[in-house]
């Protein structure tokens, strides 16, 4: 035999008190399959979660953040405070990142700057608190009698073209 | 790739102004980053002053602080380094220099380095 139930379509939810009958979701709830037995409670966004999409009868409500914090976990289950680039989130707030790493995002936290010398290369830009160092040609490029010889044109990966 | 053409060079008195050009064709997209780099005779290549071709952020060489200034026009694909109260010491072949690979996605996790062909400064009286 058939579930009854099994007819019940999303946004309804088959109940027990009325023989079974397929009945909608009563407000601020959902269903987003069909044959539920209840529905479930709407999310609500309070607070620094502010609402993305409204709660329907078929899915739930969704969250993102208030502007100055950014959503954390899966389905935004949290709030975490923003810093500015060149700053890390810690216990006591936003600090500004040490001499020698850098952020450059609002959130996440403080990188060491790349060491050119590490990969045989020589530093052409500095870092900065919100930028990596950019590092510039070998120190053998630089050296008398290097030739100033420019690098054969690097292979296109397929489905790339230049601009 | 990248094609970088030197321009602007010379003879110059001590105190004297010079404004060298760049200008970048090709893949110029990939740049990330620029660079004036200098080499007396017999000496190594140094770098003068670079620059970041997104923000516009600049480095100089204690050297010439305070006398030099590196601009770019992305509009127009070409990096300058204009050269105020020059000396003899900064006397040299100017190389343009070009730094490709982060942040372009068909290059994505390649660099490559791009030197012009040099232009020469004199600085004498």
């Known amino acids: 035999l058939q579930d009854p139930c099994s007819n019940c379509p999303a946004g309804t939810f088959c109940d027990n008190n009325r023989n079974q009958i397929c009945s909608p979701c009563p407000p601020n709830s959902f269903s987003s399959a069909g044959g539920q037995r209840t529905c479930d409670i709407c999310r609500q966004c309070k607070g620094v979660f502010r609402t993305r999409k409204e709660c329907s009868s078929t899915s739930n409500a969704e969250c993102d953040c208030t502007p100055g914090f950014h959503c954390l976990g899966a389905g935004c289950s949290m709030c975490e405070q923003d810093c500015k680039q060149g700053q890390e989130l810690t216990k006591k707030g936003c600090k500004d990142c040490c001499f020698g790493t850098f952020n450059d995002q609002k959130r996440g936290i403080c990188r060491p700057w790349t060491n050119c010398s590490l990969d045989g290369k020589s530093v052409l830009v500095n870092g900065t608190k919100e930028r990596d160092v950019v590092c510039g040609p070998s120190p053998a490029d630089l050296s008398p009698g290097a030739s100033s010889v420019t690098p054969p044109a690097p292979a296109r990966e397929p489905g790339h073209s230049p601009q | 790739q990248v094609q970088l053409v030197e321009s602007g060079g010379g003879v110059v008195q001590p105190g004297r102004s010079l404004r060298l050009s760049c200008a970048a064709s090709?893949?110029?997209?990939?740049?990330?980053?620029m660079g004036w780099y200098r080499q007396a005779p017999g000496k190594q290549r140094e770098l003068v002053a670079s620059?970041?071709?997104?923000?516009?952020?600049?480095n100089y060489a204690d050297s010439v602080k305070g006398r030099f200034t590196i601009s770019r026009d992305n509009s127009k694909n070409t990096m300058y380094l204009q050269m105020n109260s020059l000396k003899p010491e900064d006397t040299a072949v100017y190389y343009c220099?070009?730094?490709?690979?982060?942040?372009?996605?068909?290059?994505?996790?390649?660099?490559?380095?791009?030197w012009g062909q040099g232009t020469q400064v004199t600085v004498s009286s």
């Open positions: 220099y070009a730094r490709t690979g982060e942040g372009s996605s068909w290059l994505e996790g390649h660099e490559y380095d791009y």
């Open positions: 090709g893949s110029t997209f990939s740049i990330v980053a």
């Open positions: 620059i970041i071709t997104g923000d516009g952020d600049t």
